[in-house]
């Protein structure tokens, strides 16, 4: 009778084991072991027992002890079970961002590991077990579906293998995959709201505001604002689940025409975009041209108004005839025209909006000087010793210099309060002088003496 010890062994891959082959007869003709494994016999006294060191055991094996005794030949097998933890435990790659409400399939691949009967694959969220299955196939694959929720944001998913050799007197060997950190997001189906001027004048600045509600996590949202090829640099303010991005936009003559204003919100692997057209226009103020800005009374003056070729102008409220970008009027300059404003209003239609521009010029009419009865009375009669203010106003442009003299030397204090005396009486020659010439007027002052009763 042949016996083997131990009859069952579990050992690590590549490991060694001592196997003893024994026989019940004292003088066996033959005693040995049959195995493809590298073996080394350890010398022992006696004939009925042999010990072998079997080395580099890579896979399960069943070495067989045999003996040949007088009463016949017999065999005994020992069962070598090799154990080893899996080579690779991996979660199939997934995009790190996942939309809330989507089903996420987690797939764990386990390469190798033995004995498979003792190997279990566990899918985890944090420390919570989602699925536990025996390892079957090569690679062993375990999948589970998770409905992505908001509160999964930042959760770590992993895969763990458990090689449980505790029933064999060994330990529980665990291998864990690299974690997959889930980042969940909500990007609403509604496009962002874009508030901006529909038209924008060259060499001016406009303000663009892009906003969106219902985002999660709002701090991770990227906002891209652009006008044509020009990237805008917005200032973004965040609410609980909303943001508002405000940017200043400057346009130049090169941008003239219809430009696309875009606001794109990128969150996770999704984006929402709003497009708007902005018309960039150039519209200089109309030009008011006077033949000369300063003319003498009686001169013929032409007032012209010229504007953008597509504009329509009115000059002093009178539309151009025919309606268009030019208007003019003719006038003979009178003193009343001095300081008169000529206002040109131009209207341009840009993208359905009416844009108004004005330009005003003032006409200076040179006239005078003038001294008349209304402003410079020819006769004053005042009681002696009364307080009076002689008034004489000369008119003209430029304003004339006025002097009133009696006998060529004695001045009348125009515009000053004086006490009337006999000396004041007499005829004065008032002379108004300017670059336009001079005029004179005689003014008589009568002084009434008091009556003594």
């Amino acid at each position: 009778q042949t016996s083997v010890s131990p009859s069952k062994v579990i050992l690590p891959r590549g490991g060694s084991v001592l196997v003893t082959c024994s026989t019940s007869c004292d003088q066996p003709k033959l005693l040995g072991i049959e195995t493809p494994l590298p073996k080394k016999e350890l010398l022992l006294p006696g004939n009925n027992r042999k010990v072998y060191e079997l080395s580099n055991v890579q896979e399960d094996s069943q070495p067989m002890c045999y003996s040949n005794c007088p009463d016949g030949q017999s065999t005994a097998k020992t069962f070598l079970t090799v154990y080893w933890t899996p080579e690779r435990v991996e979660l199939a790659p997934l995009p790190s961002w996942q939309p809330v409400g989507k089903n996420l399939t987690l797939r764990c691949q386990v390469e190798g590991g033995a004995p498979r009967a003792n190997l279990t694959v566990v899918l985890l969220r944090g420390e919570k077990e989602l699925k536990r299955e025996p390892a079957v196939g090569e690679p062993a694959e375990v999948t589970t579906t998770v409905l992505v929720r908001r509160d999964h944001h930042g959760a770590n998913f992993s895969c763990r293998t458990e090689l449980d050799l505790r029933p064999q007197g060994l330990e529980l060997f665990e291998n864990t995959s690299a974690p997959y950190q889930l980042q969940t997001f909500v990007l609403p189906a509604t496009p962002p709201q874009l508030v901006s001027p529909r038209v924008l004048e060259v060499d001016t600045q406009g303000t663009v505001v892009c906003s969106l509600d219902g985002l999660f996590p709002v701090s991770e949202a990227q906002v891209h604002l652009a006008l044509g090829d020009q990237r805008l640099n917005p200032t973004v303010t965040y609410g609980n689940d909303s943001f508002s991005a405000k940017a200043s936009v400057s346009v130049t003559a090169e941008d003239e025409g219809t430009q696309r204003l875009t606001c794109a919100v990128i969150l996770g692997n999704q984006s929402q975009e709003t497009l708007q057209t902005v018309t960039i226009y150039s519209f200089p103020a109309p030009n008011v041209i006077l033949t000369k800005p300063e003319v003498s009374e009686g001169t013929e003056v032409t007032v012209k108004c010229e504007a953008h070729p597509r504009a329509k102008v009115t000059l002093n409220g009178v539309p151009a005839q025919p309606l268009g970008p030019r208007a003019q009027l003719l006038l003979k300059a009178t003193p009343e025209d001095n300081g008169r404003s000529f206002s040109c209003s131009a209207t341009l239609e840009v993208a359905g909006q009416l844009i108004h521009k004005n330009q005003t010029r003032e006409l200076r009419v040179l006239y005078g000087p003038r001294l008349d009865e209304r402003d410079c009375p020819g006769n004053w009669t005042w009681p002696e010793n009364s307080q009076q203010t002689p008034m004489c106003q000369a008119w003209g442009n430029p304003l004339p210099e006025l002097k009133c003299l009696k006998d060529g030397t004695f001045p009348l204090p125009i515009g000053e309060s004086v006490t009337v005396t006999r000396d004041l009486e007499g005829t004065y020659l008032c002379r108004a002088r300017s670059t336009q010439g001079e005029v004179t007027r005689k003014v008589t002052v009568n002084v009434l003496s008091p009556r003594y009763e």
């Epitope: 890579q58 080579e87 690779r88 435990v89 691949q109 390469e111 190798g112 498979r116 079957v136 196939g137 090569e138 690679p139 694959e141 690299a178």
Partner: antibody, heavy 120, light 111 residues
């Protein structure tokens, strides 16, 4: 004992397809994946791809995508490699080899190889 | 793809000599789990390749202990302490760290 028995040598004309087989025995067939390797004088050894004998999942070397198709029949413990639109470049010995799916412990047992000659 | 360069291409030996083959990788073969999936095969004339060493230094079942593997990162070596007649053939290194898996060009050990 572990054995991978491959189908015999093939002499085929350019432009056609050929399907070679690899039968596994002496082990639990679905416990190991099967890899296919091409050996030609010009390019030494080239890995074509791997098939899971359990699930039928495959991974190909990009170079052989569209050229090679790997399949498996669990019931007969046989894997197949089909090569399409053959040219003289496909003339080589094609081996199947047993391993873990990602080959982490090496290709421990190989078939005897199938010699493919493409000639008009 | 990862390129494995073997040197020398050919190695004449006397039986009983020590032989050494080098395999250099174009990038590190350390996988993210810390293991290095570099293996060695021997192909004798008219036969299919046979696995000798897996994961740099582990001898496969039935491989004599005169074969040893060493190295790390990008530089690896296979040593045969005393060459025997049955060791003659072409030796290939191979990597299973990066996809697609690749082989070295081979080193022929001859008498």
């Amino acid at each position: 004992q572990v054995q991978l028995q491959q189908s015999g040598a093939e002499l085929v004309r350019p432009g056609v397809s050929v399907k070679i087989s690899c039968k596994g025995s002496g082990y639990t067939f679905t416990d190991y994946a099967l890899h296919w390797v091409k050996q030609s004088h010009a390019k030494s050894l080239e890995w074509i791809g791997v098939i899971s004998t359990y699930s039928g999942n495959t991974d190909y070397n990009q170079k052989f995508r569209g050229k090679a198709t790997m399949t498996v029949d669990k019931s007969s413990t046989t894997a197949y490699l089909e090569l399409a639109r053959l040219t003289s470049e496909d003339s080589a010995i094609h081996y199947c080899a047993r391993s873990l799916y990602f080959g982490s412990s090496g290709f421990d047992y190989w078939g005897q190889g199938t010699a493919l000659t493409v000639s008009s | 793809d990862v390129v494995l360069t073997q040197t020398p291409l050919s190695l004449p030996v006397n039986l009983g000599d020590q032989a050494s083959i080098s395999c250099r990788s174009s990038q590190t073969l350390v996988y993210r789990n810390g293991n290095t999936y570099l293996h060695w095969y021997l192909q004798k004339a008219g036969q299919s390749p046979k696995l000798l060493i897996y994961k740099v230094s582990n001898r496969f079942s039935g491989v004599p202990d005169r074969f040893s593997g060493s190295g790390s990162g990008t530089d690896f070596t296979l040593k045969i302490s005393r060459v025997e007649a049955e060791d003659l053939g072409v030796y290939f290194c191979s990597q299973n760290t990066h996809f697609p898996y690749t082989f070295g060009g081979g080193t022929k050990i001859k008498r």
